[in-house]
């Protein structure tokens, strides 16, 4: 996983890098495998209905460097793992849901049965 | 200077197996993949496969899916084509060649005849 | 499968003239990175291929400035500004966008 504290520009990789993809397979991609310049990625975030979604998939090195960082948004819970030391790495990458803070309950909507 | 040398011309009836190698040399072979690539006689280019040899891993063409093997020995800086049971049609020369986002250097090439 | 049509199919111009040849996809080469992973290759009678032009228009170490690549998408252009008596070969586009990987049929230039 790329650490929060990582600033350098990232550096284009000699070679193509293949990834597992997962509702985030682009036209290109074949057999849910995509190929990328930058990383492959596994996200775990919530839908509309609070359900845990998991996508995966690739990143091209353009921006990569930032959405791989995982900051956090406000009123939105997920989190991503991204990783290049080997093709198909993301299939290995279980990133979780950070937990619910207090007022996620309060500022949230309020879902009836 | 990149470099990558192939084994030499085989003779070979149907039926037989085949191994031929390309050796890199002047680069880092695990930080580029290596494809094959299939020219029969005065045909034009074809794409078998390639691995990368850092990790092993293979991509092939549905059409020479099951026909072939790729495999690479990092230690030695080699990739192979192999074959466990040859037939008329395979006979043509075979490029391995090197792949980062494309192919910029080739092997000389190895002619593979299958007669009986 | 992608397929990959040049034309013509054998081209003699001129010493000293330019030849075009042109190299059409059956689906855009347009990479989700943005790149477009077209390029050409010249092979000569007997040797193996030649990477001359990668990426639509970046010409590979060593080539010649008079060979140039042009196009997006789905149509694309090698030309030699100025035909040599040593670039008699046949060219292949070939396009590493999409798996499986697959060239053109080439096209073969000779002197006229």
């Known amino acids: 996983k790329k650490e929060d504290g990582e600033s350098t520009a990232p550096t284009p990789r000699p070679k193509v890098l293949r990834c597992k993809c997962h509702h985030h397979c682009p036209e290109d991609s074949v057999n849910n495998i995509c190929s990328t310049d930058g990383y492959c990625f596994t996200m775990i975030e919530e839908d509309d209905s609070g359900l845990p979604v998991v996508t995966s998939g690739c990143l091209g090195l353009e921006g990569s460097d930032f959405q791989c960082r995982d900051t956090p948004i406000p009123h939105q819970r997920r989190s991503i793992e991204c990783c290049t030391e080997r093709n198909e790495c993301n299939k290995d990458l279980h990133p979780t849901l950070p937990p619910l803070k207090n007022r996620d309950f309060v500022d949230g909507p309020i879902h009836h049965r | 200077e990149v470099q990558l040398v192939q084994s030499g011309a085989e003779v070979k009836k149907p039926g037989e197996s085949l191994k031929i190698s390309c050796k890199g040399s002047?680069?880092?072979?695990?930080?580029?993949?290596m494809q094959w690539v299939r020219q029969m006689p005065g045909k034009g280019l074809e794409w078998m496969g390639e691995?990368?040899?850092?990790?092993?891993?293979?991509l092939y063409n549905q059409k020479f899916k099951g026909q072939v093997t790729i495999s690479a020995d990092k230690s030695i800086s080699t990739a192979y084509l192999q074959w466990s049971s040859l037939k008329a049609s395979d006979t043509a020369m075979y490029y391995c060649?090197?792949?980062?986002?494309?192919?910029?250097?080739w092997g000389q090439g190895t002619t593979v005849t299958v007669s009986s | 499968d992608i397929v990959m049509t040049q034309s013509p199919d054998s081209l003699a111009v001129s010493l000293g003239e330019r030849a075009t040849i042109n190299c059409r996809s059956s689906q855009s080469l347009v990479h989700s990175t943005g790149n477009t992973y077209l390029h050409w290759y010249q092979q000569k009678p007997g040797q193996p291929p030649k990477l001359l032009i990668y990426?639509?228009?970046n010409r590979f170490s060593g080539v010649p400035d008079r060979f140039s690549g042009s196009g997006s998408g789905t149509d694309f252009t090698l030309t030699i500004s100025s035909l040599q008596a040593e670039d008699v070969a046949v060219y292949y586009c070939?396009?590493?966008?999409?798996?499986?990987?697959?060239f053109g049929q080439g096209t073969k230039l000779e002197i006229k």
């Open positions: 060649a090197r792949f980062g986002y494309y192919v910029d250097y």
């Open positions: 990426k639509v228009s």
């Open positions: 691995i990368d040899p850092s990790d092993q891993y293979t």
């Open positions: 070939s396009q590493s966008t999409h798996v499986p990987f697959t």
């Open positions: 002047g680069y880092s072979f695990t930080s580029y993949w």
